[in-house]
């Protein structure tokens, strides 16, 4: 279970008309459910139940986004429509270049994601918890365009980190 280094870049327009980019660094773990490789894309928050919907209405999906899913306490969803792995699979099928799960309220999901799969996804499936998860969700909940850059080694040059 390798460390996933996640840079979240937030794009904000300043009064002068320039873009200010705020970069926040956080760490997660690559799960065995997916590949250990770099990925990047716009952050799209997905509700766990939103991944249940199977009516494939689109002819073509849009590719290259990073799905962020905050998992709920298992008690709140005793009979999930899909396993956590199934949800990751569904997101990747819909064009996600990576999936990040906030497992803070459902730590059991870590084991589910790390069960040796015969057919792991070809895209990274990362999980975050604790302070890193809080940091991520704070960004996701802002009305801002944000992009995640996931790397399997620390960023080469030191990045300025802004606490969101």
């Amino acid at each position: 279970k390798e460390t996933a280094f996640v840079e979240v870049v937030l794009f904000e327009s300043s009064p002068s008309g320039d873009y200010t980019t705020y970069t926040t660094g956080l760490t997660g773990r690559f799960s065995r459910a997916g590949a250990t490789l770099s990925a990047e894309g716009e952050i799209v928050q997905m509700h766990p139940l939103g991944l249940c919907n199977n009516n494939d209405e689109e002819d073509l999906y849009e590719y290259g986004w990073v799905g962020v899913v905050k998992l709920e306490q298992p008690e709140l969803d005793p009979k999930p429509c899909l396993t956590v792995l199934g949800k990751a699979k569904r997101a990747v099928q819909r064009g996600a270049t990576a999936v990040i799960f906030d497992v803070s309220e459902n730590p059991e999901a870590i084991d589910q994601l790390n069960q040796g799969s015969e057919d792991p996804l070809k895209r990274p499936v990362v999980y975050v918890k604790g302070a890193d998860a809080i940091k991520l969700m704070n960004i996701v909940n802002k009305q801002k365009v944000a992009r995640a850059r996931i790397q399997h080694r620390p960023p080469r040059q030191p990045t300025e980190y802004f606490d969101m």
């Epitope: 794009f11 873009y19 716009e42 799209v44 849009e62």
Partner: antibody, heavy 116, light 107 residues
């Protein structure tokens, strides 16, 4: 079937305003980011603005402070408010679905002509 | 802002010929560049995304490559229906920017 239909274009005087609409159907509109792109007749493409699923927005330098992108998920509609219009804003305006970039689906465009 | 320089601006080619169009970016953008095809009177269509991935439904004679800040669109053997305008777009950081376009015509 995924469809995007732009409307609201027309002839407008310099300095005046216009509001473009893009009506979406055939997909879950609220789940997708949306772009506006424009094209001066017979010329190249210019990316104009983007709105994310959580209503975060970014704009091209040329329109910043004058144009406003917005969305109404209940009405499955994307908007572009054009203020302080200039002759250089004359173009066909397209809406397109996508996250980081305008993707697989574009509308057929609506023509905005700015002239006195 | 990231500048995108596309060349050539126009291109005359014969049917069956190999065609190459290039976009150069002013800074490193990883693989965050797309190619679009636009036929007269139509909206642009996504042809290649993330520099090398062919959009579903597009013919396999189209391909994309990149090295550093240089991106290439190749048509291995030109067909009549490929006569169109081609644009590249960088989507690494906003504001996103298109190349000026290449008008591909039959010789």
């Amino acid at each position: 079937e995924v469809q995007l239909v732009e409307s609201g274009g027309g002839l407008v005087q310099p300095g005046k305003s216009l509001k473009l609409s893009c009506s979406a159907s055939g997909f879950t509109f609220s789940s997708y980011g949306m772009h506006w792109i424009r094209q001066t007749p017979g010329k190249g493409l210019d990316w104009v603005a983007y709105i994310s699923t959580n209503s975060g927005t970014v704009y091209a330098d040329a329109v910043k402070g004058r144009f406003t992108i917005s969305r109404d998920n209940a009405k499955n509609t994307l908007y572009l408010q054009l203020n302080s219009l200039q002759s250089e804003d004359t173009a066909i305006y397209y809406c397109a679905r996508g996250y980081n970039y305008p993707g697989a689906y574009w509308g057929q465009g609506t023509l905005v002509t700015v002239s006195s | 802002d990231i500048q995108v320089t596309q060349s050539p601006s126009s291109l005359l080619a014969s049917l069956g010929e190999r065609v190459t169009i290039t976009c150069q970016t002013s800074q490193s953008i990883s693989n965050n560049l797309n190619w679009y095809q636009q036929k007269p009177g139509q909206a642009p269509m996504l042809l290649i995304y993330y520099a090398t991935s062919l959009q579903t439904g597009m013919p396999s004679r189209f391909s994309g490559q990149y090295s550093g800040r240089s991106f290439t669109l190749t048509i291995t053997s030109l067909e009549p229906e490929d006569i169109a305008n081609y644009f590249c777009l960088q989507h690494y950081n906003p504001p996103y920017t298109f190349g000026a376009g290449t008008k591909l015509e039959l010789k």
